[in-house]
């Protein structure tokens, strides 16, 4: 993961560019952990990045991701209480030029070096779940969420709204 000074340069570069025709409205750094407080970490191996879900040793520093928030250009088609806000999508980048990417064919979550504009597979609809947890739904495959399977991130199909709070698709964001 990159240091703060690198992030500031990177953030500025992102703001200066237009991604899928839009720029992020907000960006900040956060660490990502599971509902059970395991950390999501990123390691460079053989010139590609691997994603791990693991318990960190005491005092071990958490990896940070740059969360970039984008307003959907289309109003949500959900019925409800007349909400007039625009749906938010996020991209997650643990290091410069690499973004989390949904591979729907393999049901996997991968880190890809992406050219701008970013592909739709890099965008996730953000959901607020219980206990200050969030979930990430694939823009390209509604009903499919980033989840934890066998100590790795995977894509998990959620069949009904009752299953939205299943622990393996719940994540915590922490800025500390």
């Amino acid at each position: 993961a990159f240091g703060i000074s690198g992030v500031q340069k990177y953030t500025r570069a992102l703001h200066d560019s237009s991604i899928t025709g839009i720029s992020p409205i907000t960006e900040y750094l956060a660490s990502l952990s599971t509902y059970n407080d395991q950390s999501i970490t990123f390691a460079l191996e053989d010139e590609s990045y691997e994603i791990y879900v693991e318990d960190l040793k005491k005092d071990e520093k958490k990896d940070k991701v740059l969360l970039s928030y984008y307003e959907s250009q289309h109003p949500s088609n959900e019925s409800g209480d007349g909400v007039d806000g625009k749906m938010l999508m996020v991209t997650l980048s643990p290091t410069k030029d690499f973004w989390l990417h949904a591979n729907n064919k393999e049901h996997s979550v991968e880190l890809h070096k992406c050219e701008k504009p970013l592909p739709d597979q890099a965008f996730f609809v953000l959901h607020n779940m219980h206990s200050n947890c969030v979930s990430f739904e694939c823009k390209t495959d509604p009903g499919v969420f980033i989840g934890v399977k066998d100590n790795h991130l995977a894509l998990i199909k959620v069949d009904s709204s009752e299953n939205l709070c299943t622990e393996n698709i719940l994540f915590k964001l922490s800025e500390t």
């Epitope: 409205i25 907000t26 900040y28 750094l29 956060a30 928030y69 307003e71 949500s76 959900e78 409800g80 209480d81 909400v83 007039d84 806000g85 625009k86 749906m87 938010l88 609809v125 953000l126 959901h127 607020n128 779940m129 200050n132 969030v134 979930s135 939205l164 964001l173 922490s174 800025e175 500390t176």
Partner: nanobody, 121 residues
Framework: QVQLVESGGGLVQPGGSLRLSCAAS????????MGWHRQAPGKQRELVAV???????NYADSVKGRFTISRDNTKNTVYLQMNSLRAEDTAVYYC???????????????WGQGTLVTVSS
């Protein structure tokens, strides 16, 4: 429906200070972040500062060391303390919040109407 109401804008001399407030109300379930953007005449809207529910902050380079963002989570209110104001800070300041409502888990972006800050002698 989620409403954001800003206050605190006005005319101030260069070097002066102002404090903006923004209160969110409505059927709010969870707020992910609250922040301030600004738009000067003839320019694009730009991020000024953001504070997350966990207290993390991010500032535009042009305001670092002069502006401070803070948030009262219990009141769903965000504040922007602006010190050492310059003429180039003149803009309409908009409050922005990312939140979900009781009717949906989906996080949405909401905007206030804006408050004008004019820095001039």
């Amino acid at each position: 429906q989620v409403q954001l109401v800003e206050s605190g804008g006005g005319l101030v001399q260069p070097g002066g200070s102002l404090r903006l407030s923004c209160a969110a109300s409505g059927s709010i379930r969870t707020v992910n972040y609250m922040g301030w953007h600004r738009q000067a005449p003839g320019k694009q809207r730009e991020l000024v500062a953001v504070v997350t529910s966990g207290g993390g902050t991010n500032y535009a380079d042009s305001v670092k060391g002069r502006f401070t963002i803070s948030r009262d989570n219990t009141k769903n209110t965000v504040y922007l303390q602006m010190n050492s104001l310059r003429a180039e800070d003149t803009a309409v300041y908009y409050c922005n919040a990312a939140a979900s409502t009781y009717s949906s888990t989906v996080v949405r972006s909401f905007w206030g109407q804006g408050t004008l800050v004019t820095v001039s002698s």
